[in-house]
Interface confidence: low
């Protein structure tokens, strides 16, 4: 007995084919041996069968002893044993109907959990393997859990049903609701603007919510909030903002903030979160700044760093053109009497430049 | 972790009707099909047949006729029904837990099984 | 239904050796086939499924093979803890359907 497996709602054409390739008798019936449709003379006829309005047959490929059975908007429930009968003998055709749908809406938040449930007919003994856009192998029986969605999980999720070694492919489109980013680290020169910007890594027809800056700087005991703003149709609004910094804010996505000036009092660490309507739940994106500040005071030439920066990392305070380097994994280094010329700090990653400022100096006669 | 235990009375007379439940414990009766084999004195297993959680079942050709099966979600419970007994019907009954992956299928979790006895 | 022919049907062991039981199915199941362990008086457990994958926590000296219609369940080296009867089980097709068994006991 031949199987064919199908989706819920798509079409699924039956084959059944005769040894003269011309046109001949035939009907469909199901297992409980009502007719669902045949041929009488040159037309289709249909019998009293559940099917009767779904299904149809291709009369072109008639005459070529072609007798196929087309079924329209498939359903579990037709999941059946199909037989044809033509030139004296009836094919069987077994025909299982496998539906997968997301539990819940398919836009979902970073770390919220996706279900993808299989309908399947009584029964029916398959196995579901779904791959996620990032390449990620998920398999099980009836349902398929993914506890914590991360933002590659976004995209077109390719679910291959199983069963009697036939397979049905099922594309279903996820939308992870997340920023582009975990965290990200803004390195500046005191005194520079700062630039933070936070890409959400979707997009939707209508954005509507509201966010906050939650800022800790280093030197601070306690976070504060730094800005509030809502969202409308992705155009952003700020409700209320600290003295100081005075952030600025654009008014469109992806959502952008501006801070006037890098000072030391304001490295640290923020977080950014944005609540959307009808979503439990909300989206986050850790900030960091680290403000470098170089100064010349009396004889000391000193070069610091503030915020939040790995213990691997290197500052070294150079003379152009010259072999002079003091190097430490610390958020501070200084020279003593430093030879004049133009000095460089810098702030750097396994040899890749992360910071750096430059401050001249004079000769003392 | 799941377990099963079969109850019902351990003897029935001829023609009438064996009844039997298993009450699953320590886990959720869905998502599974749950099933009932049998085992004559020093014979084999004879798959009786299995019920779904929707209600929908299958049963063994050989003993379609006489059986039926239904579960009760509620009560975390399921059951056979084996209609018109002889001694032939004599054994030690099973419910199990039929599990489904990639690959497998089997009965993964048993009760310790029911004797059951057909006798006048 | 498919029918699953054991053999033997019963065999007499000393404890390291090597015990090898056959199971043939009336028609091809692929790889759908299962092993179980029954030991007297209690219920069968799951040794092998797929022909040939271990089950978690069965010993690696049980090992499966075979595929279509002939398949072979072997005790690589026999433990007194190994006596029991083994079942062949299909699952290619409903009603899923067993082998007649193998009690394996000590010569």
């Known amino acids: 007995k031949k199987v064919v497996l199908g989706k819920k709602g798509d079409t699924v054409e039956l084959t059944c084919n005769a040894s003269q390739k011309k046109n001949t008798q035939f009907h469909w019936k199901n297992s409980n041996q009502i007719k669902i449709l045949g041929i009488q003379g040159l037309f289709l006829t249909k019998g009293p069968s559940k099917l009767s309005d779904r299904a149809d047959s291709r009369k072109s490929l008639w005459d070529q002893g072609c007798f196929s059975m087309i079924i329209k908007n498939l359903k579990i429930e037709d999941s059946d044993t199909y037989i044809c009968e033509v030139e004296n003998k009836k094919e069987e055709v077994e025909l299982l109907v496998f539906g997968l749908t997301a539990n819940s809406d398919t836009h979902l938040l970073e770390g919220q959990s996706l279900t993808l449930t299989l309908e399947s007919p009584p029964g029916s003994s398959p196995s579901v393997k779904c791959r996620s856009p990032g390449g990620k192998n998920i398999q099980g029986g009836r349902t398929i859990s993914v506890p914590q969605l991360e933002r590659q999980d976004s995209g077109t999720w390719t679910c291959t049903v199983s069963q009697d070694q036939k397979t049905v492919e099922f594309k279903i489109d996820i939308v992870v609701l997340a920023f582009q980013k975990a965290s990200s680290t803004v390195y500046k020169k005191e005194g520079e603007q700062v630039e933070f910007s936070f890409p959400l890594a979707f997009t939707l027809e209508k954005l509507t919510g509201s966010g906050e800056l939650w800022w800790q700087a280093e030197r601070a005991s306690s976070s504060k909030s730094w800005i509030t703003f809502d969202l409308k149709n992705k155009e952003v609004s700020v409700k209320r903002v600290t003295q100081d910094p005075k952030l600025q804010m654009g008014k469109k996505l992806p959502l952008h903030l501006t801070l006037p000036q890098a000072l030391p009092q304001y490295a640290g660490s923020g977080n950014l979160t944005l609540a959307l309507e009808a979503k439990t739940g909300k989206l986050h994106q850790e900030v960091n700044l680290v403000v470098m500040r170089a100064t010349q005071f009396q004889e000391n030439l000193t070069c610091e760093v503030w915020g939040p920066t790995s213990p691997k990392l290197t500052l070294s305070l150079k003379l152009e053109n010259k072999g002079a380097t003091v190097s430490k994994q610390a958020k501070a280094v200084w020279v003593l009497n430093p030879e004049a010329g133009m000095w460089q700090c810098l702030l750097s990653d396994s040899g890749q430049v992360l910071l750096e400022s430059n401050i001249k100096v004079v000769p003392t006669w | 972790q799941v377990q099963l235990l079969e109850s019902g009375p351990g003897l029935v007379k001829p023609s009438e009707t064996l009844s039997l439940t298993c009450t699953v414990s320590?886990?959720?009766?869905?998502?599974?099909?749950w099933s009932w084999i049998r085992q004559p004195a020093g014979k084999g297993l004879e798959w009786i047949g299995r019920i779904y959680i929707s209600g929908s079942t299958n049963y063994n050709p050989s003993l379609k006729s006489r059986v039926t099966m239904s579960i009760d979600t509620s009560e975390n419970q399921f059951s056979l029904n084996l209609s018109s007994v002889t001694a032939a019907d004599t054994a030690v009954y099973y419910c199990?837990?039929?599990?489904?992956?990639?690959?497998?299928?089997?009965?993964?979790?048993w009760g310790q099984g029911t004797t059951v006895t057909v006798s006048s | 239904d498919i029918q699953m022919t054991q053999s033997p049907s019963s065999l007499s062991a000393s404890v390291g050796d090597r015990v090898t039981i056959t199971c043939q199915a009336s028609q091809d199941i692929s790889n759908y086939l299962n092993w179980y362990q029954q030991k007297p008086g209690k219920a069968p457990k799951l040794l092998i499924y797929n022909a040939s994958t271990l089950e978690t926590g069965v010993p690696s000296r049980f090992s499966g093979s075979g595929s279509g219609t002939d398949f072979t369940f072997t005790i690589s080296s026999l433990q007194p803890e190994d006596i029991a009867t083994y079942y062949c089980q299909q699952y290619d097709n409903l009603p899923l359907t067993f082998g007649g068994g193998t009690k394996v006991e000590f010569k």
């Open positions: 199990a837990r039929e599990l489904e992956r990639p690959y497998y299928y089997g009965m993964d979790v």
């Open positions: 320590g886990g959720s009766i869905s998502s599974y099909y």
